[in-house]
């Protein structure tokens, strides 16, 4: 179907900075330290290849990756197909974030990544600590009061939480561009669904208590005829593709070696268990620590608090996919009416979860709209 997969792309072994400079773009690399000691790599593409001479402040755009992913998501295609490069060439000051636990955010001032304590986090902490620290850093560095936030998948989830619970942070967001938004996962058809059959008392037994490696857990649910061909074999053993789904028709297969070498970028077992709880409950709420006593210690209440997206007044534009297994259209349908400042919505009927970052036609379907909307915002 796909022929042989040849690892021919040099970016396979590169880090984020190297990938950016490989394509001839300027790169700045920073370390942001969160309030609880996590050290997150943040990259900046201050301008494009052809507009370095333009003086004056450029609007700041911050890109936040999704579940099991990293900042490389935004730069894994050729420059004319990668959102980070497209935005830089359009005259914007582009910043790429990383969430704790991924390849580029696996250090802490107090804990080693070999320790259980390092991995005791979920998307709650990404919203509570990672986003504020990174956005504060960008605001200070650029001297600009506001920025445009682009999130994909879990990058939207932590945006919903942070901007609805932290009003001072919300004030710093000019517009929130949400790609494949995830709040509730009540209707998800992703294989993440299968994790809900694992009882809480057995989750750590099966997956450990540090980084999430599904090993061969999902094999029992994968149709063997789908996963028999060489390239599909590679996808079928990759946690990102297992959980998000994949669509061979819209992929540039010559870039698959890059996608596979940089993904999954890693997250904690606790984070995956939080997502499992969300599938089970059908609700958008904080991590359930497993007992009323434990929850009281963390939240001063016996049940984990719900996240209320109606409290988020940031202007938001939403793109979702009709074939998205993780951000199911029914869940998106529940989300949209709750957004008090929804300024745009587009459903792309044939898009799946990863098409928003890697599809060959993503510029036409999504990115050009974002560029236009940011430029309208400048006026």
């Amino acid at each position: 179907l796909f022929g042989k997969l040849h690892p021919g792309s040099p970016e396979v072994t590169m880090n984020i900075s190297q990938m950016i400079t490989y394509w001839g773009y300027p790169n700045e690399e920073y370390e942001v330290v969160t309030e609880d000691g996590y050290i997150l790599e943040v990259n900046r593409i201050p301008y494009g290849k052809k507009n370095s001479g333009n003086t004056g402040q450029r609007p700041v755009v911050f890109l936040q990756h999704g579940l099991l992913a990293s900042a490389t998501n935004w730069i894994s295609n050729l420059p004319n197909n990668s959102l980070a490069f497209i935005l830089a060439d359009a005259g914007y000051d582009v910043w790429l974030g990383n969430s704790r636990g991924n390849t580029w955010a696996r250090r802490n001032l107090y804990y080693s990544p070999d320790s259980v304590e390092f991995w005791a986090f979920s998307f709650d902490e990404m919203a509570k600590y990672d986003l504020p620290a990174t956005i504060d850093f960008i605001v200070k560095k650029t001297g600009q009061k506001q920025l445009h936030y682009v999130g994909h998948s879990q990058g939207t989830t932590i945006g919903f939480i942070a901007f609805s619970t932290n009003p001072s942070l919300a004030k710093r967001i000019k517009t929130f561009y949400a790609l494949a938004p995830v709040a509730t996962v009540k209707y998800t058809k992703s294989l993440i669904n299968k994790l809900r059959f694992v009882p809480q008392s057995l989750f750590k037994f099966i997956f450990g208590d540090k980084i999430f490696y599904p090993h061969n857990f999902f094999d029992q649910f994968l149709a063997t005829e789908v996963c028999s061909r060489e390239m599909l074999n590679l996808l079928c053993s990759n946690a990102l593709f297992i959980i998000c789904g994949f669509d061979s028709k819209n992929f540039n297969t010559s870039r698959l070696d890059v996608y596979l070498s940089h993904n999954p970028a890693g997250t904690s077992v606790q984070n995956m268990f939080h997502w499992t709880q969300a599938v089970k409950s059908g609700k958008f709420q904080a991590y359930d620590w497993g007992s009323p006593v434990q929850n009281r210690m963390h939240y001063d209440q016996s049940q984990p608090p719900y996240y209320n997206v109606t409290a988020m007044n940031v202007p938001i534009a939403v793109w979702n996919g009709g074939k998205d297994l993780l951000a199911d259209p029914q869940d998106v349908g529940l989300l949209l009416p709750k957004l008090p400042n929804l300024i745009y919505h587009k459903e792309i009927p044939f898009y799946n979860h990863l098409d928003f970052i890697w599809a060959m036609d993503a510029p036409q379907e999504v990115y050009n709209d974002i560029v236009s909307m940011i430029s309208e915002d400048k006026k």
Epitope: S115, V116, E117, P199, Q200, S201, L202, K204, F205, G208, D209
Partner: nanobody
Framework: QVQLQESGGGLVQAGGSLRLSCAAS????????MGWYRQVPGKQRELVAA???????YYVDSVKGRFTIARENAKNTVYLQMSSLKPEDTAVYYC??????????????WGQGTQVTVSS
Amino acid sequence: QVQLQESGGGLVQAGGSLRLSCAASGSTFSFNAMGWYRQVPGKQRELVAAIGNDGATYYVDSVKGRFTIARENAKNTVYLQMSSLKPEDTAVYYCKGRGGLTQYSEHDYWGQGTQVTVSS
């Protein structure tokens, strides 16, 4: 030193039954969870069934309705009753226990394995 010892493996005909046992010794704590994995030469070790100290169980799809996991918490012992055995159940079966004195000192403890061979 915590040690896990499996027993009960052997050769059985397709459709037959076996009962595997695994006993822990040297442990100063009760395991939070115990379970069984299996491995065929050249393949990854795979989960078969697990049981928590709260009695919650998990089975992989291929053994549901045929295998039953049980546990004696006080003895840190786990059993796997295997019936309607198939040739594809042939593997080395390993016992695993997970526990520790605190949530930050939990470890996985493994047995040496016991061979189960199902002939057609």
